[in-house]
């Protein structure tokens, strides 16, 4: 997250970190069910661990943390690497979470976002770009949903209805390491960090997010079919 600020503790209990060995964050994810996460399809890896209820990026033990293995990864059938359309994936955890103030699912919004909606994006991704500097703790950033026209104008021929753009003033954006993390609007999960300009936080180049309102049926049916 570029030019965000430290999230208040316990305010993002659905935020998950996907880790490669040794405790190496590579993507964010979101708890949407006691045993299921949503993340970006481009975050697919064969072997990874899931950390929930953790505030700092470092692997230091925190009393609220819960660790899991991902036992099943189900990318959306419409996703094709390395594209960005249909960029979402469900991950089944090896067991159900223990609900606490630090670990709690969030509902996926069935309403598509309208321009001007205020949202919050979070993650442990780099706070600088193009060089890399990871934060000590979870970062939060207020962003506004842009109209689909502004989104298409920013990225000609790259945007479809499985994506939406959101941003703020130049210099504020999601970035490397935030992929798959949540965009929360009006208390519901509206999007996942998907892609954006290179380097991040360029003027008139907003972040692009998976438009989850288009996938509520697939999410529900996939969880039911695999539970």
């Amino acid at each position: 997250i570029i030019n965000g600020s430290d999230c208040d503790m316990h305010t993002q209990p659905w935020q998950a970190a996907l880790l490669l060995r040794p405790n190496q964050l590579y993507c964010g994810a979101v708890l949407v069910h006691p045993q299921w996460l949503l993340t970006a399809a481009h975050c697919r890896k064969k072997v990874f661990r899931v950390r929930l209820g953790h505030y700092s990026l470092s692997p230091v033990y925190e009393s609220g943390q819960q660790m899991f293995q991902g036992v099943k990864s189900i990318p959306h059938p419409g996703y094709s690497h390395p594209g960005h359309s249909n960029d979402l994936m469900l991950i089944k955890l090896n067991r159900r979470i223990r609900p606490t103030k630090d670990v709690r699912p969030i509902n996926v919004s069935s309403h598509c976002p309208s321009a001007g909606t205020k949202c919050l994006v979070s993650g442990w991704g780099t706070t600088k770009s193009p060089q890399v500097h990871f934060p000590k703790v979870l970062q939060c950033l207020n962003i506004s949903v842009l109209s689909q026209k502004r989104c298409e104008d920013a990225y000609p021929r790259q945007i479809d209805d499985t994506m939406f753009c959101a941003g703020d003033k130049a210099g504020r954006d999601s970035c490397q390491g935030d992929s798959g993390g949540p965009v929360v609007c009006n208390g519901s999960l509206q999007g996942l960090v998907s892609w954006g300009d290179y380097p991040c936080a360029r003027p008139n180049r907003p972040g692009v997010y998976t438009n989850l309102c288009k996938f509520t049926k697939w999410i529900q049916e996939t969880i039911q079919a695999n539970s």
């Epitope: 490669l20 970006a40 390395p82 990871f134 790259q158 390491g177 380097p199 360029r202 692009v208």
Partner: antibody, heavy 124, light 107 residues
Framework: QLQLQESGPGLVKPSETLSLTCTVS??????????WAWIRQPPGKGLEWIGN???????YYNPSLKSRVTISVDTSKNQFSLKLSSVTAADTAVYYC????????????????WGQGTTVTVSS | EIVLTQSPGTLSLSPGERATLSCRAS???????LAWYQQKPGQAPRLLIY???SRATGIPDRFSGSGSGTDFTLTISRLEPEDFAVYYC????????FGGGTKVEIK
């Protein structure tokens, strides 16, 4: 199958500007999933990264070359270009163009497709 | 800038032997941002490993990468005749840089 091909003059005079083009075939530059890079290798030496460009035109340059480098993209021709001004004999090298995958995960995917390289000699 | 120092400069081995190549960074680098390349004379570099330990598409499993912080290693478990080449590490954690290379030659 994606292929990259460098082209440009093989001989440049000192103090002039080196200009090279990389033509992309079998794939499209206007893709949000990749960036495009220039790397060089002086004779008998190692590799030096020059800079990257994204399809949108956003660039990232090697700080030691930044004052002399311009990388641009022409999506209509599926090409990207390198200009290096005020060249000296130290700029004599094989120049490569390459492609790298890009997303917002915290993973560097490396540069997976390279051109075969073009030799540029700086001499009067 | 982050300086990558590769050692040894030259490694003389026979086919079938194990090769261990070292790459040391002047400051800590996230392992996610380290790659290895192979280069043969007159050819462009070829991506072998990204993210310190993930094999690129089509790379045989005799190539493996490991390490974190400032110390990274490329291992070739059993050298094949086509593996004799120069190997470069590269970081993209800050402004991208390459190591000076290790030449693996036939003993």
């Amino acid at each position: 199958q994606l292929q990259l091909q460098e082209s440009g003059p093989g001989l440049v005079k000192p103090s002039e500007t080196l200009s090279l083009t990389c033509t992309v075939s079998g794939g499209s530059i206007p893709s949000s999933s990749y960036y495009w890079a220039w790397i060089r290798q002086p004779p008998g030496k190692g590799l030096e990264w020059i800079g990257n460009i994204y399809y949108s035109g956003s660039t990232y340059y090697n700080p030691s070359l930044k004052s002399r480098v311009t990388i641009s993209v022409d999506t209509s021709k599926n090409q990207f270009s390198l200009k290096l001004s005020s060249v000296t004999a130290a700029d004599t090298a094989v120049y490569y163009c390459a492609r790298g995958e890009y997303d917002r995960s915290a993973l560097y995917y490396g540069m997976d497709v390279w051109g075969q390289g073009t030799t540029v000699t700086v001499s009067s | 800038e982050i300086v990558l120092t590769q050692s040894p400069g030259t490694l003389s081995l026979s086919p079938g032997e194990r090769a261990t190549l070292s790459c040391r960074a002047s400051q800590s680098v996230s392992s996610s941002y380290l790659a290895w390349y192979q280069q043969k004379p007159g050819q462009a570099p070829r991506l072998l490993i990204y993210g310190a330990s993930s094999r690129a598409t089509g790379i045989p499993d005799r190539f493996s990468g490991s390490g974190s912080g400032t110390d990274f290693t490329l291992t070739i478990s059993r050298l094949e005749p086509e593996d004799f080449a120069v190997y470069y590490c590269q970081q993209a954690f800050s402004s991208p840089t390459f190591g000076g290379g290790t030449k693996v030659e036939i003993k």
